[in-house]
């Protein structure tokens, strides 16, 4: 690659690496979102005492977060690589209707919080790229992820609290079951 | 081979409008923080616009803000910088260069308009603004 022109001696361009294969980059990006869910994390934590509760069955009762199954071939025990992305890919596409729940609910993480989004729909199109099987993937239906978010919306302030931590917990579980079976891929 | 090619550049009035394209061969764009710079004669490079390709969020000089805008289509592994309202001083030759400085969560936006963050630098396009 040309260094550009005009360098000089405190502005010198970075040296030639080898370029980001696809398994690479999706390991980085996964990770990038694990460090923004605990940006979120962090601040979840502070400002209440959800992630010490004992009471998450409450909540959880009224949300449907994408779990890793043993049939979704993503663990050890029989793994199944095609499975296990169209696994992760309709997972991913799940969880953006929480996403987008959480983007109203921090103060100082807004950018945080927005940069989660947006880098998951980010992971999303690399992983497709990489899934050969397209069409096994489900999206979800828009009119049922707008009345979900209406009726998360709609609930008591300690349940939306709870809700955000227990959206935030589910995530960051989700990824890093992820991010261990694409490094078997 | 591993290059940057830009496109789209030309003579354009003052206050006219033009899009320039960044696409790459033997890598993948989409997976690389892409900044635009320029570099007028006599003058040293400076950076214009970037996007991350983390979270796709953007950062634009002073000197371009509200004229420019960097977008990316990760389908078609192409980044675009349209330029609207061109002054003459904005005549120069216009590079694209992909780097990795979005991969860190929290990363500072306004360090992706420095050279040494990038790894794959363009050949350049002319840009003249001119009546």
């Known amino acids: 690659a040309p260094v550009p022109p005009g360098e000089d001696s405190k502005d010198v361009a970075a040296p030639h690496r080898q370029p980001l294969t696809s398994s690479e980059r999706i390991d980085k990006q996964i990770r990038y979102i694990l460090d923004g869910i605990s940006a979120l994390r962090k601040e979840t934590c502070n400002k209440s005492n959800m992630c010490e509760s004992s009471k998450e069955a409450l909540a959880e009762n009224n949300l449907n977060l994408p779990k890793m199954a043993e049939k979704d071939g993503c663990f050890q025990s029989g793994f199944n690589e095609e499975t296990c992305l169209v696994k992760i890919i309709t997972g991913l596409l799940e969880f953006e209707v929480y996403l987008e729940y959480l983007q109203n609910r921090f103060e100082s993480s807004e950018e945080q919080a927005r940069a989660v989004q947006m880098s998951t729909k980010v992971l999303i199109q690399f992983l497709q790229k990489k899934a050969k099987n397209l069409d096994a993937i489900t999206t979800p239906d828009p009119t049922t992820n707008a009345s979900l978010l209406t009726k998360l919306q709609a609930q008591n302030q300690w349940l939306q609290d709870m809700t955000t931590h227990l959206i935030l917990r589910s995530f960051k579980e989700f990824l890093q079951s992820s991010l261990r079976a694409l490094r078997q891929m | 081979q591993l290059q940057l090619v830009e496109s789209g550049g030309g003579l354009v009035q003052p206050g006219g409008s033009l899009g320039l394209s960044c696409a790459a061969s033997?890598?993948?764009?989409?997976?690389?923080?892409i900044g635009w710079f320029r570099q007028a004669p006599g003058k040293e490079r400076e950076g214009v616009a970037c996007?991350?390709?983390?979270?796709?969020?953007?950062y634009y000089a002073d000197s371009v803000k509200g004229r420019f805008t960097i977008s990316r289509d990760n389908a078609k592994d192409t980044v675009y910088l349209q330029m609207n309202s061109l002054k003459p001083e904005d005549t120069a030759v216009y590079y694209c260069?992909?780097?990795?400085?979005?991969?860190?969560?929290?990363?500072?936006?306004?360090?992706?308009?420095?050279?040494?963050?990038?790894?794959?630098w363009g050949q350049g396009t002319q840009v003249t603004v001119s009546s």
């Open positions: 260069a992909a780097g990795t400085w979005d991969l860190k969560f929290g990363y500072s936006r306004s360090n992706c308009v420095r050279s040494y963050e990038y790894d794959y």
């Open positions: 996007i991350s390709s983390s979270d796709l969020s953007t």
């Open positions: 033997g890598f993948t764009l989409a997976y690389y923080g």
